[in-house]
């Protein structure tokens, strides 16, 4: 019997300083490139090794970026979102949504190997 999969959603403000090679991540999404069904939001698809985001350590693959320097990323074309990041300046403030998967087992059941606390 499989457990239910739930998600813990949290938001965080991440301030990055643009490094010599930029911010150091890739994005997917946009109104013309829906990465998640019925969601035209912008998501992080790659964190570049030794880039600004990787060195900061808080931004993760799969995070949804809600805003850049206070500018909402809703209803943007993919390339417009890319351009927004590229023109965001030296100090970049990202409002991000982390979505952590939480596996819940059936109520009243502890599977083999589960820590007993």
């Amino acid at each position: 019997m499989n457990g239910r999969v739930d998600y813990l959603v949290t938001e965080e403000e991440i301030n990055l300083t643009r490094g010599p090679s930029g911010l150091g991540f890739n994005i997917v999404g946009g109104t013309d490139q829906q990465y998640v069904s019925n969601d035209s939001g912008i998501y992080v698809s790659r964190i570049k090794e030794n880039g600004a985001a990787a060195l900061d350590g808080r931004l993760q693959e799969g995070d949804k970026i809600l805003s850049v320097n206070g500018q909402d990323l809703k209803n943007l074309l993919h390339q417009d979102a890319v351009d927004l990041f590229r023109n965001a300046g030296y100090a970049v403030s990202l409002r991000v949504q982390h979505r952590l998967q939480v596996q819940n087992g059936p109520i009243g059941h502890r599977g083999e190997g589960d820590p007993s606390g």
């Epitope: 930029g22 911010l23 150091g24 997917v28 990465y35 698809s45 790659r46 390339q79 890319v82 590229r86």
Partner: nanobody
């Protein structure tokens, strides 16, 4: 993890044509930034062409002769190679990364890509 498989290589006479294919796994193929590189024996890996969400890029040595394209419904990228020359002889390798960089894109930089195929041999006699 993304798997890339190239096909379409072979032996062709100078002036001839070939079409290479690179088929990728994954349900979000349309979001991939993709490229072709080539490597001749004893030489460095060399950028050939790339295709992003917003456009295409070519090495000067192939401009006007090669065309990169993709079919998102088939999870496949193509390289149409015309007017082939003996110096085009190499193993042609497909590369990909998910999404678009938010930084300045350098299509010829191998570090832009996370996934690589095994390659397909092209020999021009």
């Amino acid at each position: 993890h993304v798997q890339l498989v190239e096909s379409g290589g072979g032996l062709v006479q100078a002036g001839g044509s070939l079409r290479l294919s690179c088929t990728a796994s994954g349900r979000t193929f349309s979001t991939y930034t993709m490229a072709w590189f080539r490597q001749a024996p004893g030489k460095e890996r060399e950028f050939v062409a790339a295709i992003t969400w917003s456009g295409t890029y070519y090495a000067d040595s192939v401009k006007g002769r090669f065309t990169i394209s993709r079919d998102n419904a088939k999870n496949t990228m193509y390289l149409q190679m015309n007017s082939l020359k003996p110096e085009d002889t190499a193993v042609y390798i497909c590369a990909a990364v998910i999404g678009s960089t938010v930084d300045s894109y350098t299509p010829s930089d191998p570090l832009e890509y996370d996934y690589w195929g095994q390659g397909t041999q092209v020999t021009v006699s």
